[in-house]
Interface confidence: medium
């Protein structure tokens, strides 16, 4: 079975200081799947952020950078210049 495990349950981020979110794929090679990132905000709305390769949700391309780390089997999402509007719960997912 495939398992996607986040690096941290909570990530403290400073405004304007780049932050990195990571998910580890266990049980399979991450290169065999497409990685997706979503953000859930207070209203329980799930918003699409990123999908391999280089597909971004509206308004996310300028401040987010998605990638995979094949060497360590990680999905990576970088928030380039975090602001208060980036608060929320971030989810990684995969599909074929």
């Amino acid at each position: 079975a495939i398992e996607l495990v986040p690096e941290h349950q909570t990530v403290p981020v400073s405004i304007g200081v780049p932050a990195t979110l990571r998910c580890s794929m266990k049980g399979e090679a991450i290169g065999n799947y497409y990685i997706n990132w979503y953000r859930k905000t207070q209203g329980n709305t799930m918003t699409f952020i990123y999908r391999e390769k280089d597909i971004y949700g509206p308004g996310f391309k300028d401040n987010f950078q998605g990638d995979i780390d094949i060497a360590k089997n990680l999905a990576v999402l970088k928030i380039l210049a975090p602001s208060e509007r980036d608060e929320g719960s971030y989810y990684c997912a995969c599909d074929t």
């Epitope: 690096e7 200081v17 780049p18 990195t20 990571r22 580890s24 266990k26 990638d67 780390d69 094949i70 060497a71 360590k72 089997n73 990680l74």
Partner: antibody, heavy 120, light 111 residues
Framework: QVTLKESGPTLVKPTQTLTLTCTFS??????????VGWIRQPPRKALEWLAL???????HYSPSLKSRLTITKDTSKNQVVLTMTHMDPVDTATYYC????????????WGQGTLVTVSS | QLVLTQPPSVSAAPGQKVTISCSGS????????VSWYQQLPGTAPKLLIY???RRPSGIPDRFSGSKSGTSATLGITGLQTGDEADYYC????????????FGGGTKVTVL
């Protein structure tokens, strides 16, 4: 508590093969994401990355030394072994093994290093 | 074959601030996280900063890191005599297969 210790010969002759062993404790090289790398430092010079092996046996080598290097692991003994062929006096250096952080490409724990001198 | 460029030396008086630059390319620093190491004389390197700006537990907040484009910077404030050491930047290069790269090192001297 993570510890690593390098062992091997302190003196090798030119053209010989160097075999270094890194014996570690405090982590397992079967744990997802874990890697052990080798880095060397010639006297009064900079650090130079040599090789790295992962929990899943994936191996990575410095392009300039790839033909001379082999890295292997023995998870039952908690050891990583580096062999380097055709040793030359310019390979005289302190050789370190180090643990790579589970989530990133940085070395968070290092061995004390072992000085290897290549001379006839 | 150093692909990360650092100044050979920097110096400052106790209590002052020093910054060390590390310049790379799009395939290493530009696309990956940077780490910094402190090497006191006669000892093994020690991790100071990882993920560009994060400190391992036990590292004082006098040490800070940042990254912009293809360059990274290490800052040391409130310089102390015990900070006299060599400092190395490191990242990995994902242009071909994964390879790890170090800078040439910077000697920090406390005047």
């Amino acid at each position: 508590q993570v510890t690593l210790k390098e062992s091997g010969p302190t003196l090798v002759k030119p053209t010989q093969t160097l075999t270094l062993t890194c014996t570690f404790s405090g982590f397992s090289l079967t744990t997802h994401g874990v890697g052990v790398g080798w880095i060397r430092q010639p006297p009064r010079k900079a650090l130079e990355w040599l090789a790295l092996i992962y929990w899943n046996a994936d191996k990575h080598y410095s392009p300039s030394l790839k033909s001379r290097l082999t890295i292997t692991k023995d998870t039952s003994k908690n050891q990583v072994v580096l062999t380097m062929t055709h040793m030359d006096p310019v390979d005289t250096a302190t050789y370190y093994c180090a643990h790579e952080g589970d989530w990133g490409h940085y070395f968070d724990f290092w061995g004390q290093g072992t000085l290897v001198t290549v001379s006839s | 074959q150093l692909v990360l460029t650092q100044p050979p030396s920097v110096s400052a008086a106790p209590g002052q601030k020093v910054t060390i630059s590390c310049s790379g390319s799009s395939s290493n620093i530009g696309n990956n996280d940077v780490s910094w190491y402190q090497q006191l004389p006669g000892t093994a390197p020690k991790l100071l900063i990882y993920d560009n700006n994060r400190r391992p537990s036990g590292i004082p907040d006098r040490f800070s890191g940042s990254k912009s484009g293809t360059s990274a910077t290490l800052g040391i404030t409130g310089l102390q005599t015990g900070d006299e050491a060599d400092y190395y930047c490191e990242t990995w290069d994902s242009s071909l297969s994964a390879i790890w790269v170090f800078g040439g090192g910077t000697k920090v001297t406390v005047l």
